[in-house]
Structure formats: C-alpha cells, structure tokens
Amino acid sequence: ASNFDCCLGYTDRILHPKFIVGFTRQLANEGCDINAIIFHTKKKLSVCANPKQTWVKYIVRLLSKKVKNM
C-alpha cells in the first residue's frame, strides 16, 4: 500500500515482531498523505501500519528499546 515511498493505507494483518528488523515513521506533514509506521521485515518487505493501533505501538516500543539498549 505504498506509492513513491509513501504509505497510502495500512495492513489489515497483525505482524509478529520476530519478523521485523526495523521501522520508519511516515509523517503526514512531511509530503505524504497519512501518518504511518513502515515496518521493515527480514524478507526485505516494507509494510505500512496504523500508528494508532496498539500492536503497532507495542512493536515500535520494543524495537526502540532494543536500539536504545545496544
């Protein structure tokens, strides 16, 4: 659900954190239409997720903590 590196919508699947290696924040006020979290998977896929959903916030926080503790 992305076009020119912008997410246009969100995945309707819940991704497991074990498949996710990192994420990028997309901000609506920086050239894209919607706020999004772009998860980067081990299989080199980019998945657009809704930053308001609890599972997304949870994974973002786990990944951020992992980076902080490195």
Epitope: H16, P17, N50, Q53, T54, W55, K57, R61, K68
Partner: antibody
Framework: QVQLVQSGAEVKKAGSSVKVSCKAS????????ISWVRQAPGHGLEWVGG????????DYAQNFTDRVTISADKATKTVYMELRSLRSDDTAVYFC??????????????WGQGTLVTVSS | QPVLTQPPSASGTPGQRVTISCSGS????????VNWYQQLPGTAPKLLIY???QRPSGVPDRFSGSKSGTSASLAISGLQSEDEADYYC?????????????FGGGTKLTVL
C-alpha cells in the same frame, strides 16, 4: 461475553514471591494485550506490565523490570504475573485488564475482579 | 507519583454538571487518545470513555469526554447519586523510560 477471572487473595511474607493468574473466557486469545494494573490501599491505578500473548513478548514498567515476570499460556488462555522480592509496599489489589490490539484505541475494555496481595513483614 | 494530573476531589448536587480535568504532556495525552475509567467502591474499574470522547455501549450519554492539546476533561451532566465513585484518566505514553500506559491519580466524586 468475555470475562477475565483472577486467582484468589494471597498473603505473603516480605522477600517471597507471588504468582497471580488471569483466565480469559468467551473469546479468542489472539488479538488481545493483557496488562496488570495494581492499586495500593487508598491509592490510584499503576500499570505494572503487559503481554501480547500471540507475540509472547512481555514488557514492564521501569519500577518493576527486575522483579516481575508476565507470561501467557495460550492453550488455557491464562496470563500470569509473578512478583518477586515482595515488600510491604507491594500490598495492593492486582487487576488484569484487556486491550484489543487491532483497534486504534488503547482502552482497557474488560477488567478482572482483582486479586488482593497482602505482604506481611 | 501519577504521570497524569487530576484534582483529588470534585463534588456536586444531583442534577448538576461536574467537570474533571486531566493534564499530561506531549508524550502521552498530546500524542495519544485519552480513556476514562469509573471505579465504584470495592469494584474493578470500568471503561467509561475511550478515544477521547467515545462511549462504550451501556454508558449513559450524561458522560462525555474531550481533549485539547495535552489536557483532557470528563463532564458528567445531570449528576446522580450512583455517579459517586473514583474517576481515572489514562493514556498510552510514547516515552521509552516510562510505562506504556499512564494513569491520573484519580478524582473522588462526591454527590452532595
């Protein structure tokens, strides 16, 4: 109707551990986060930690990181909270509470009945 | 020390309108939605308002919520004796050092 049913009251000695359970009934376990929230006598609510059972990954409030373990048994739809090195100020009612993780709100829509843990010195 | 700030007490007479405030910061209320819980004496908290201003089914429309910036408020109109309870605001917190979910210290509502 979804319910969270918690284990019974516990009286423990300072320095010991307690393990409280929270069993979900009436719904699948796959799209929930289960949190533990405690309330000391006459005090407000404090988030202890939580787990998304389908991820099998727990996280904790900083105050509790070294003393608490939250785990889930997907087969029995039960979440456990173990608190170690108990102190008298751990005396509180411990609630489990559910959040639906696929919604775009973080509300605890269903709560357990609470488990009173009393720590005596 | 609670992360969100609420007045410890509020009161009103039956039929009156009462408002309870909740103040936070950019990492919680400022960037996430606010939920309100009602706790009657000796019972578990109950969800009263979610996503700033949404009522779960079964909650009377006398209860309403709003949010502006880093503050939120709960309004109860047509106050009734059964509204006497503790009210807590809560929100997700984005700061890595704090807990995921943060609560206010609670407001004890007395119906005079």
């Amino acid at each position: 109707q979804v319910q969270l049913v918690q284990s019974g009251a516990e009286v423990k000695k300072a320095g010991s551990s307690v393990k409280v359970s929270c069993k979900a009934s009436g719904d699948t376990f796959s799209n929930f986060a289960i949190s533990w929230v405690r309330q000391a006598p006459g005090h407000g609510l404090e988030w202890v930690g939580g787990i998304i059972p389908v991820f099998n990954t727990a996280d904790y409030a900083q105050n509790f990181t070294d003393r608490v373990t939250i785990s889930a048994d997907k087969a029995t739809k039960t979440v456990y909270m173990e608190l170690r090195s108990l102190r008298s100020d751990d005396t509180a009612v411990y609630f489990c509470a559910r959040t639906k993780i696929e919604l775009d709100n973080d509300a605890f829509d269903i709560w357990g009945q609470g488990t009173l843990v009393t720590v005596s010195s | 020390q609670p992360v969100l700030t609420q007045p410890p007490s509020a009161s009103g007479t039956p039929g009156q309108r009462v408002t309870i405030s909740c103040s936070g910061s950019s990492s919680n209320i400022g960037s996430n939605t606010v939920n309100w819980y009602q706790q009657l004496p000796g019972t578990a908290p109950k969800l009263l308002i979610y996503s700033n201003n949404q009522r779960p089914s079964g909650v009377p429309d006398r209860f309403s919520g709003s949010k502006s910036g880093t503050s939120a408020s709960l309004a109860i109109s047509g106050l009734q004796s059964e509204d006497e309870a503790d009210y807590y605001c809560a929100a997700w917190d984005d700061s890595l050092n704090g807990p995921f979910w943060v609560f206010g210290g609670g407001t004890k509502l007395t119906v005079l």
